[in-house]
Amino acid sequence: IFPLAFFIYVPMNEQIVIGRLDEDIILPSSFERGSEVVIHWKYQDSYKVHSYYKGSDHLESQDPRYANRTSLFYNEIQNGNASLFFRRVSLLDEGIYTCYVGTAIQVITNKVVLKVGVFLTPVMKYEKRNTNSFLICSVLSVYPRPIITWKMDNTPISENNMEETGSLDSFSINSPLNITGSNSSYECTIENSLLKQTWTGRWTMKDGLHKMQSEHVSLSCQPVNDYFSPNQDFKVTWSRMKSGTFSVLAYYLSSSQNTIINESRFSWNKELINQSDFSMNLMDLNLSDSGEYLCNISSDEYTLLTIHTVHVEPSQETASHN
């Protein structure tokens, strides 16, 4: 199995390899096969990464940062393969690697530019701060700095606060948007141009529902086909907001097809789930069930949030008893 990395061919014997933080990559190098093979990989033409000659590795003078992280494809050397297998790349590994290969006939030089990207799955959160409502798109660890765009009802909006903290390895980014009093739908896109990876968060508010005590309510939650791929692992969580914090009512994991229900009056229709419809029922409503209900469908590539506001009113019987 080859590690996730892709090569971009550019002129002058130089290739660009893009790897992901903490994953393994291959720095490619080939040569015209010959005898008396010497392979010498160097970083920035100064640090020794890997040396091979007289039929075996010689790593006594290898720079310590590469210890136990490099190897060659030994069975392939006689076929002209001098590629370097490189374990657990970090952002500090970025730079130019030069492979010098000597044979009885000639010395060849291959340069490889290694770029490393980070993209931990972002999240979209809905938060209440006093009387204000916020949508927050955030990514805990990303490199290089991503492009974040917001849309309201499919129209790009320029208001784009970005709270950024940088560490040695990567950036942590929050992009909050004040949506107080809005019934629009919102979309946030975070793009890592190096890894060619895009994540989208989408937020939709449904019309408020008015119900009587002891009735049941049905709340819809269906993914938007543009983003949703049932073959990809995802998680669905239903939660209720009470006094500013969400408590989880139930969740579903697509990988195991497991449903976990924390509220006995909550029910999910298994057949609808099989059709990718995650609508839920809450039975026997009481006054304290009034509030906001959030359906969160999340995968590595998207988060879809659907908000329902439920108002539970006293039934006539209850009102007349009081």
Partner: nanobody, 132 residues
Amino acid sequence: DVQLQESGGGLVQAGGSLRLSCAASGFPFDDYSIGWFRQAPGKAREGISCISSTHGTTYYTDSVKDRFTITRDNAKNTVYLQMNNLKPEDAAVYYCAAGLDGLACHRRDSGSRYRTQLYDYWGQGTQVTVSS
């Protein structure tokens, strides 16, 4: 710790001789070719001679051929450059450098023979002055 230490430089009259030494430590000497380079003020560093370990082959640039002789003593981890019939244009700082055998001082690929990138370790240099 890797070290290459040149010695034997000095002031000599034109037509005279000097013997430069390059003492190596901290790396497997037998696996490395050793090259001699020189740099005169305002000029680029140039490779003038090298000796491979595996084949024991020696190479010289045209300007020093028949006047300079390179030898190595693997028991002492030392390479010598015997310089005879010195000329004023030989005046420069002389450096020794070590590169993996089979890359540096390549026996077939003369274009790569003195490529500085193929030499991993360098000495500090010794001054040679030739008076006319």
